[in-house]
């Protein structure tokens, strides 16, 4: 049985990433973890230099 | 075609160990996480934890309920995974599933039952 | 943990009746990077192990008959099965995989009177 991708990837968007479809990855951690353990992105206002929170990468199949 | 098989399962006496594998079939096993589930009789499933794939070498996660007593490994050159049960208990006397996980647990094997009896 | 609740406990109707089960979790299951709820849906039929139906909370799984349908977001969901045959009797579980650990409901029992 051949595996297809695990994620599609339109022209933008970004890498394939090496998690299952039930997980999301990590990019500080660098890892796949359970999406709820990420904290959504949300804009930094202009000038802000604290911290971004955790994102994850995770394309719909 | 997919299959799980589950063996392994049998009497044991409380504190006592119990090592479950997991034979697969139908895929590539080191692309896939695999994930072991129980039911004890007439009751709810129960998650108990998974391994990732090689892509994430090989990583595990577990339920806090069994983590430090159960430890889930796999041999992929023979294509099977374990869960290996130690300090056993009457309330782990159960019927434990091993499955695949990708979009969620996609697909399970038969199950094997395990008694935990003096 | 993530309290996974299902009701009824169980229920029986005819062929062809409509059905629906509730599950709720005790946290939203939303993930709003993707809008994808982390629910799936298993059926249990008796004596055997448990089959994957319906996962990212409708999204069907390939061969589930189009009857059964998963809807819902964030802590409340709906499996509805539109025209109940006999082969459905069974007790349907949710299960949530949004975080670790992941857990299940306590299951809904269909009965074919």
């Known amino acids: 049985m051949r595996r297809g991708p695990r994620s599609l990837r339109g022209r933008d968007a970004p890498a394939p990433t090496p998690c299952v479809p039930a997980e999301c990855f990590d990019l500080l951690a660098r890892h796949c973890v359970a999406c709820g353990l990420l904290r959504t992105p949300r804009p930094k206002p202009a000038g802000a230099s604290s911290p971004a929170p955790r994102t994850a990468l995770q394309p719909q199949e | 075609e997919v299959k799980l098989v589950e063996s392994g399962g049998g009497l044991v006496q409380p504190g006592g160990s119990l090592r479950l594998s997991c034979a697969i079939s139908?895929?590539?096993?080191?692309?896939?996480?695999m994930s072991w589930v129980r039911q004890p009789p007439g009751k709810a499933l129960e998650w108990l934890g998974f391994?990732?794939?090689?892509?994430?070498?090989?990583?595990?996660e577990y339920n806090p309920s069994v983590k430090g007593r159960f430890t889930i490994s796999r041999d992929n050159s023979q294509s099977i995974f374990y869960l290996q049960m130690n300090t056993l208990r009457a309330e782990d006397s159960a019927t434990y599933y091993c499955?695949?996980?990708?979009?969620?647990?996609?697909?399970w094997g038969q199950g094997t039952t395990v008694t935990v009896s003096a | 943990d993530i309290v996974m609740s299902q009701s009824p406990s169980s229920l029986a109707v005819s062929v062809g009746e409509k059905v629906t089960m509730s599950c709720k979790s005790s946290?939203?299951?939303?993930?709003?990077?993707?809008?994808?709820?982390?629910l799936a849906w298993y059926q249990q039929k008796p004596g055997q192990s448990p089959k994957l139906l319906i996962y990212?909370?409708?999204t069907r799984e390939s061969g589930v008959p189009d009857r059964f349908t998963g809807s819902g977001s964030g802590t409340d969901f709906t499996l509805t099965i539109s025209s109940v045959k006999a082969e459905d009797l069974a007790v349907y579980y949710c299960?949530?995989?949004?975080?670790?650990?992941?857990?299940f409901g306590g299951g809904t029992k269909l009965e074919i009177k």
């Open positions: 990212w909370a409708s």
């Open positions: 139908g895929f590539t096993v080191t692309a896939y996480y």
């Open positions: 391994i990732r794939d090689k892509a994430n070498g090989y990583t595990t």
């Open positions: 946290q939203s299951l939303l993930y709003s990077s993707n809008q994808n709820n982390y």
């Open positions: 499955a695949q996980v990708r979009r969620a647990l996609d697909y």
């Open positions: 299960q949530q995989y949004y975080t670790y650990p992941y857990t």
